[in-house]
Interface confidence: low
């Protein structure tokens, strides 16, 4: 007799589990959710990661897994618990019929369930013509400190650990979690199996062609001989690293994830946990010529996501595809025809291309920076990577038009000196996801936990927006942008800075309705203005133009439209000083910019006036950019006049601290 699933030859009722009677209902009002990969061919139905609520203990995870098995067996279904997670995320990996999902979602402690999916190595092609080992001159790249204090974990294919480039530098762990190769006649060949991982290990720490020649590496096998792995296998690998870190704490850890799959909530969550445990994660943006936010782990905010450029600093094209792009990319790095160790023989070299190679470069740079300054936090490291990058060298025409403004024009570079950057006030720009077009839609941009939100701006391609405001969320300030009726959606743009011992607050002035416009200033003693935002409820602010120039002696003042509420970001930090810099153009102009001088860092960027023909304002490196509608569509010349307002800051405290160290 067949059961309802048609899965077994005979139906045998399961013995009642001693725990099956304890069927606790999930907490009232909470509903667990189900997630699966948006890219259908990458789905792996039949295997599910059941993620439990954050505070769930291992014993509760095991009990929940057993309860699922018992309840499934009573319905005539077989299930198999493949792994119980603890250390990073509580939960378990289960092989079961999709028919059981509804049952599983109702189990106690369940937060969400994700169907397993594939991840892939991000290098193309795997084997080009073999080249002779490059000969290096004595004056070639010889870094002073090759990352010797740092351990780099590589989650990839198997590797040829006896290759002369990496021999003695890479420890192959006993970790292996890979799916079987596709196809019934797949023939495993060691050199092919090891190709991807060996090359990347060489790029990171190779004797001749490595970035961080002193870094030691540990390899975990999560990709099979075809360069394919699973989200679940990668999760177990990340958990293995966390457990290793807990059992035997070492110096700074860098984890290189040269792989990508579809967007995965659980993989991003695991990366977030590991990052918050002090591990630096570097990943490939993906080779799909697509928005990196649609892929994981590239879309995890805590991960350093790397796109690929070539020797001419152009985005890398890979066949019909190429490097991913967009707001989830942190920076780009060399990723075309990169010379590295070939697994064809122990002295062979080969060239490979892809965002995997780009990520390996950044992992190497990170290892060197951390070796020079082991106490650097993830936020500090990311800011330094951005700060020392080559700016505005990438030809943005390669990217889709709507992605150009969102994609960082940064190519990773080693700092000229690994020490002495401490005096700098570091800031970066963080774009939100698109709000969507509904009338009340909003978009939120957030800074990393140990960064300060110093200003908030917004941008809409249609110009239909209702501004932005800084607001508290979970004890931290976030930047929220508001869409307007008929608008296609908005972006929120946060300016996130490293400002030790900062005390920041937001001062708000409601709409003034007076002809002079709305004003707000930082009135607390010792607080300086770092950013201005404006938000309005009306659909169209009209053409009222407030005075652009501030009264003398009032540098700490934000001014705006009389129908808008104005928000001033006011900060107190040791030695912090800021100044307002404006650039106004009387004639209509699609783009107006103003930059901070050398030694000053852009913290705030806004537009005057806040009228509807202004698309928005955003910071690009140290330049404030204000965009307006196409001048041919704006009516009068007076309405076309726009001023870009930059707030430039520096920290005398950081400068002094740096001098004392030298």
């Amino acid at each position: 007799q067949e059961d309802e699933d048609g899965d077994y030859e005979e139906l045998v009722l399961a013995l009642r589990s001693e725990e099956d009677g304890l069927a606790e209902a999930p907490e009232h009002g909470t509903t667990a959710t189900f997630h699966r990969c948006a890219k259908d061919p990458w789905r792996l139905p039949g295997t599910y990661v059941v993620v439990l609520k954050e505070e769930t203990h291992l014993s509760q995870s095991e009990r929940t897994a057993r309860r699922l098995q018992a309840q499934a067996a009573r319905r005539g279904y077989l299930t198999k618990i493949l792994h119980v997670f603890h250390g990073l995320l509580p939960g378990f990996l289960v092989k079961m019929s999709g028919d059981l999902l509804e049952l599983a979602l109702k189990l106690p402690h369940v937060d969400y369930i994700e169907e397993d999916s594939s991840v892939f190595a991000q290098s193309i092609p795997w084997n080009l013509e073999r080249i002779t080992p490059p000969r290096y001159r004595a004056d070639e790249y010889q870094p002073p400190d090759g990352g010797s204090l740092v351990e780099v974990y590589l989650l990839d294919t198997s590797i040829q650990s006896d290759h002369r480039e990496i021999e003695g530098r890479v420890m192959v762990t006993d970790f292996e979690n890979v799916p079987e190769e596709d196809g019934t006649r797949f023939h495993r060949q060691a050199s092919k199996c090891d190709s991807h991982g060996t090359h990347l290990a060489g790029v990171v720490s190779g004797r001749d062609a490595g970035v961080a020649k002193g870094a030691s590496m540990r390899s975990l096998r999560v990709l099979n001989c075809q360069g394919k792995g699973t989200v679940s296998g990668t999760l177990i690998g990340l958990e293995f690293i966390r457990k290793s870190q807990l059992v035997q704490p070492v110096g700074p850890l860098v984890v290189l994830l040269p792989l990508a799959g579809g967007y995965s909530r659980v993989l991003n969550a695991a990366c977030q946990r590991l990052a918050r445990a002090g591990v630096v994660l570097v990943t490939a943006a993906g080779n799909f010529r697509d928005d990196a936010c649609l892929y994981s782990p590239a879309s995890a905010p805590e991960v350093i996501t790397v796109g690929a450029t070539n020797a001419q600093d152009q985005p890398v094209t890979l066949g019909t595809l190429g490097t991913n792009f967009g707001r989830c990319v942190d920076l780009f790095a060399p990723g075309e025809d990169i010379i590295g160790a070939s697994s064809d023989c122990s002295t062979c070299f080969v060239s490979q291309s892809g965002t995997s190679q780009a990520a390996a470069h950044v992992a190497g740079i990170a290892a060197m920076m951390l070796s020079a300054e082991p106490e650097l936090t993830l936020a500090e490291l990311r800011q330094r990577l951005i700060h020392f990058s080559a700016k505005d060298v990438i030809n943005e025409a390669w990217f889709p038009e709507d992605q150009r403004v969102l994609t960082p024009n940064l190519v990773a570079a080693l700092p000229p000196s690994t020490h002495g950057a401490g005096w700098q006030l570091f800031c970066r720009t963080v774009w939100s996801a698109h709000s969507g077009p509904t009338r009340m839609a909003t978009a939120v941009a957030r800074c990393a936990p140990d960064e300060e939100l110093l200003s908030c701006s917004s941008f809409s391609r249609s110009g239909k927006r209702r501004g932005e405001r800084m607001e508290a969320q979970g004890g931290k300030l976030v930047c929220r942008a508001h869409n307007a009726f008929g608008g296609e959606g908005v972006y929120a743009i946060a300016r996130c800075c490293l400002l030790p011992q900062a005390n920041c607050s937001v001062h708000t002035a409601p709409p003034a309705e007076a002809s002079m416009g709305t004003r707000v200033h930082c009135h607390q003693q010792g607080h300086v203005l770092t950013g201005c935002s404006s938000h309005w409820e009306v659909e169209d602010l009209g053409t009222h133009k407030p005075p652009v120039l501030r009264p003398r002696g009032q540098p700490n003042q934000c001014v705006g439209h009389r129908e808008a509420s104005i928000h001033a970001s006011c900060c107190h930090a040791p030695g912090l000083e800021c100044k307002v810099k404006e650039h106004g153009i009387p004639a209509p102009q699609e783009q107006v910019t103003v930059a901070c001088e050398e030694g000053w860092t852009l913290t705030g960027c806004s537009a005057l006036p806040g009228t509807s023909h202004v698309l928005g304002a955003y910071a690009v490196d140290n330049t404030c950019v204000v965009r307006s509608r196409d001048v041919s569509t704006t009516g009068s010349t007076s309405e076309g006049a726009v001023t870009a307002v930059a707030i430039c800051c520096r920290s005398r405290h950081l400068a002094q601290a740096s001098q004392e160290l030298q």
Epitope: G6, D7, Y8, E9, E10, V12, L44, G46, T47, L78, T79, K80, L82, K95, M96, D116, P179, E180, E181, D182, G183, T184
Partner: nanobody
């Protein structure tokens, strides 16, 4: 619970052939991988061959590819491993195993398999 019983082992000359059989009983799933593994004294258990439920999809270890043939009869819940051109290094205890809910195309790792037979000994004399 699935019970697996192997048969057909014994002693054979190098270059000869042998057929091993595996009979499954109990709560056998409709969709499962039937695999054969072997373990020589003092060595780890290693994958030999596997077959999917349809019988048309098979997978072999490099060491036996071209010499061995795996087959199964779903109506009888049984599977066979035909071994040809046997070598002394093929001597081992052979186990049949079932992966009751496959997550992958083929399972070659011991940890994937849920049920195991007791094993049958195969000795190849030179």
């Amino acid at each position: 619970q699935v019970q697996l019983v192997e048969s057909g082992g014994g002693l054979v000359q190098a270059g000869g052939s042998m057929r091993l059989s595996c009979a499954a009983s109990g709560r056998t799933p409709r969709h499962y991988i039937l695999g054969w593994f072997r373990q020589a004294p003092g060595k780890q258990r290693e994958f030999v061959a596997a077959i999917r439920e349809s019988g048309s999809r098979t997978y072999y270890a490099d060491s036996v590819r071209g010499r061995d043939t795996i087959s199964r009869d779903n109506t009888k819940n049984a599977g066979d491993l035909q071994m040809n051109s046997l070598k002394p290094e093929d001597s081992a205890t052979y186990y049949c195993a079932v992966d009751q809910y496959p997550t992958t195309e083929f399972s070659t790792q011991v940890g994937h398999y849920d049920y195991w037979g007791q094993g049958t000994e195969v000795t190849i004399s030179s």
